[in-house]
Interface confidence: low
């Protein structure tokens, strides 16, 4: 098995290696190939081992408060086979202290606050040393604490560190003061070490006075063009007191037309007059209102310092802005019906100039080549309309004043083009049929539907029939489904290729509108030689083949 | 092929930092030792420590309070800091892989070398 | 640490000599954990053996290593002329990690 003591190194060695011990294993005589060596944290690096005798070395200077023990494994191996002599085994190195290190204070800088004439005896703050050595070995590590700078007006808990009040402040006299604490290790005896701390002890305040206005009037202008919650100006009172007791909130105490506000910047305790609601020169062009100051927090028992509050009077001038001309609405709607002649009346626009002068307003349209607009507002067409083109104008109309040019607004105006039923319905495409030779009457030869450009008021209805002389000697026949779709039907039994090889059907579509509108469509029909099943697609190669100068017998 | 490039000034003032990075291409860092060797001019060479790709570090005890030594997996690099450098400090610096345990410390390959000048 | 010195300092050999490089440790090394380089004039030393004796891949066989303990050989059999250069020997059985002085191989 392995043979081995427990392994101690003093720290802060000065010698460039420290003999620790010997990791040996029993069943090595001193004439075997044992080859040790050590594993883990440390190895290598802060302790080396002889690979041959197992003795460890500490190469480094080593500080038992940076690590007080290293926890290592060993292993044993015959070079000679390669193989384990002893299992892997784990070990530890102690690190033995000494009084090397001095009682250091890790939470500085301390400060602490406490209430200006707080009672003798108050708790001010407790300080702490720590002494990195190890406190199990003698009183390397045990503290005493004494005050070195403070008196009369503190004192020191020998044993805890605690800081009290000894004597009464007052912060108006002095408001900080410093205190110097020492910590001994080894209870203060010889040979300790000592570490100092310096306390910087703030008296608080409490809320004796309120805050006060310096100036009684303040004169501040604002922009009639200015937007709600623009700052116009700032105020400032004064407060004799420190922190919190010397934040202040400002308020308005009179202000009939309820046009101002005042906000409190709590960073810089001044006070921002703010715009509620906006001015109008040309409405009323100066305003007086009256703030106040008060401390935001005050404590029941400070009442008395903070009975009246300090007020100010505020007069604002309103300057006057050359302003846009406005519109009487902000948008608006025209309706006019399609296919009225040019130069006919749209609406009328209208806007004026706020200002005092009323200049007078010159109106245009943004480029649109459909409508003009005269110096009234009119807007008139100048060209015919057509729905079935464009049935809504997004127009944008600009205001001008003609004493200031560049005084502009502009508002958007929809024109929407009313429908007149001056389209009649067509075919929805181009219809091409065939029917062959052997065709029994009756058979459907085409289902045809149509299409209408006019809007439909409620809803399109169509009436498809034959012209007069399809009517009176057509081969075919048509009927009307109701539902704006009609089939094509024959109307005999039997074609002939050769005689009358194509039809054209004129077929008739009217509208519902008012009055209604007719139109006249071609339906063309090619007669095919068929198969005996009657085969469309026999009829549409035949024809197709036709159609590329073939003839097929 | 694993492929080893140092980077870094050429040179570097007395009392100053030097700063040199070595780029591992071809192969991963992962598993592996990585070492820094030096050599003064017309002098022997100089092992100045390693460090695992895990980021654990031996330094020659000769530089041991002024070496500082980095590696970044990521990027598959290196690094080496000496502070407080003398005219003695002026050398080739090596970058080189170890073996991949702790026990093979043969050093194969090298990267080219970069020589660092201390001068004012 | 182990100190390692190189004999001898500069070999003067002509091409196909036989080249013979000590290296002398202060203190055992053993003979797993030596090993030789080659380097050239503004190159990087370059791995010839590890563990004393074996050959690093593609180092022809004309360089061989041997020893153990505190004595240790290079031996180039037979000089060709990429072979003069500087070549150092190495301990990497004890931290810190030490290299020879080195020897200069130079033509004759």
């Known amino acids: 098995g392995w043979v081995w003591n427990q392994f101690f190194v003093p720290e802060e060695m000065n010698t460039t290696s420290h003999h620790v011990g010997r990791l040996r294993s029993d069943l090595d005589n001193g004439n075997n190939s044992f080859q040790y060596k050590l594993l883990g944290a440390g190895a290598g690096s802060t302790f080396i081992i002889d690979e041959r005798t197992g003795d460890i070395y500490a190469i480094e200077k080593l500080d038992r408060e940076e690590r007080s023990l290293y926890i290592l494994r060993a292993q044993v191996i015959d070079i000679t086979t390669g193989r384990a002599v002893e299992p892997e085994s784990e070990f530890v190195i102690k690190v033995s202290d000494i009084n090397d290190n001095e009682p250091k204070f890790l939470d500085e800088p301390y400060e602490a606050i406490v209430p200006e004439m707080s009672p003798e005896g108050t708790l001010v703050i407790q300080v702490t040393a720590s002494d990195a050595d190890d406190p199990s070995s003698g009183n390397n590590a045990r503290l005493l604490y004494s005050l070195l700078q403070g008196q009369p007006y503190f004192s020191v808990e020998p044993t805890t560190g605690v800081i009290r009040i000894s004597s009464k402040m007052d912060r108006e006299l002095q408001d900080e003061y410093w205190v110097i604490i020492q910590a001994k290790d080894m209870i203060g005896q010889p040979g300790a070490l000592s570490g100092t701390t310096s306390v910087l002890i703030k008296l608080s305040d409490v809320n004796d006075n309120k805050p006060i206005f310096k100036e009684s009037l303040y004169r501040l202008t604002v922009s009639e063009s200015a937007p709600t919650g623009t700052s116009i100006g700032t105020i400032m009172a004064y407060d004799n007191d420190i922190g919190e007791n010397a934040e202040m909130d400002y308020s308005i105490e009179e202000d009939d037309s309820q046009t101002f506000d005042i906000i409190t910047n709590h960073e810089t305790q001044e006070g921002i007059v703010i715009l509620k609601k906006k001015v109008n020169f040309e409405h009323q062009n100066h305003y007086g209102i009256r703030a106040k100051v008060k401390n935001h927090h005050v404590d029941e028992q400070l009442m008395k310092y903070h009975t009246e509050a300090s007020t100010t009077f505020i007069k604002i001038q309103v300057e006057d802005v050359d302003e846009p001309p406005l519109f009487l609405l902000p948008y608006y709607i025209f309706e006019i019906f399609e296919e009225t002649p040019q130069g006919s009346f749209v609406g009328v626009v209208s806007a004026t100039d706020p200002d005092n002068r009323k200049s007078p307003i010159r109106y245009s349209i943004t480029r649109s080549k459909v409508f003009n607009i005269d110096d009234n507002g009119t807007i008139t067409t100048t060209n015919s309309l057509d729905r079935e083109i464009s049935a809504w104008y997004n127009l944008s109309i600009t205001a001008t004043e003609k004493y200031n040019i560049e005084q502009i607004s502009s508002i958007p105006v929809y024109v929407q083009v009313l429908n007149i039923n001056d389209h009649a319905p067509e075919f929805s495409q181009y219809y091409e049929s065939y029917v062959c030779e052997n065709a029994g009457s009756g058979q459907v030869i085409q289902t045809i539907s149509a299409v209408d450009r006019d809007e439909s008021i409620e809803e399109h209805h169509f009436y498809f029939n034959l012209s007069v002389e399809d009517t009176n000697s057509s081969s075919f026949t048509i009927i009307d489904n109701q539902d704006n779709t009609a089939v094509i039907l024959t109307n005999r039994t039997g074609f002939n290729l050769q005689e009358e090889p194509i039809f054209y059907i004129s077929i008739l579509i009217a509208d519902n509108g008012i009055p209604s509108l007719t139109s006249t469509n071609t339906l063309t029909i090619h007669v095919c030689d068929c198969d005996d099943s009657g085969s469309t697609q026999t009829c549409q190669y035949q024809e197709l083949m036709l159609s590329m100068g073939f003839k097929t017998e | 092929q694993v492929q080893l490039q140092e980077s870094g000034p050429g040179l570097v003032k007395p009392s100053e930092t030097l700063s040199l990075t070595c780029t591992v291409s071809g192969g991963s860092i992962s598993g592996y030792y990585w070492s820094w060797i030096r050599q003064p001019p017309g002098k022997g060479l100089e092992w100045i420590g390693y460090i695992y790709y895990i980021g654990s570090t031996n330094y020659n005890p000769s530089l041991k309070s002024r070496v500082t030594m980095s590696v970044d997996t990521s990027k598959n690099q290196f690094s080496l800091k000496l502070s407080s450098v003398t005219a003695a400090d002026t050398a080739v610096y090596y970058c080189?892989?170890?073996?991949?345990?702790?026990?093979?410390?043969?050093?194969?390959?090298w990267g080219q070398g970069t020589l660092v000048t201390v001068s004012s | 640490e182990i100190v390692l010195t190189q004999s001898p300092g500069t070999l003067s050999l002509s091409p196909g000599e036989r080249a013979t490089l000590s290296c002398r440790a202060s203190q055992s090394v053993s003979s797993s954990y030596l090993a030789w380089y080659q380097q050239k004039p503004g190159q990087a030393p370059r791995l010839l053996i590890f563990g004393a004796s074996s050959r690093a891949t593609g180092i022809p066989d004309r360089f061989s290593g041997s020893g153990s303990g505190t004595d240790f050989t290079l031996t180039i059999s037979r000089l060709e002329p990429e072979d003069f250069a500087v070549y150092h020997c190495?301990?990497?059985?004890?931290?810190?990690?030490?290299f020879g002085g080195g020897t200069k191989v130079e033509i004759k």
């Open positions: 080189a892989r170890d073996g991949s345990s702790g026990w093979y410390r043969w050093f194969d390959p």
């Open positions: 190495q301990q990497y059985g004890n931290s810190p990690l030490t």
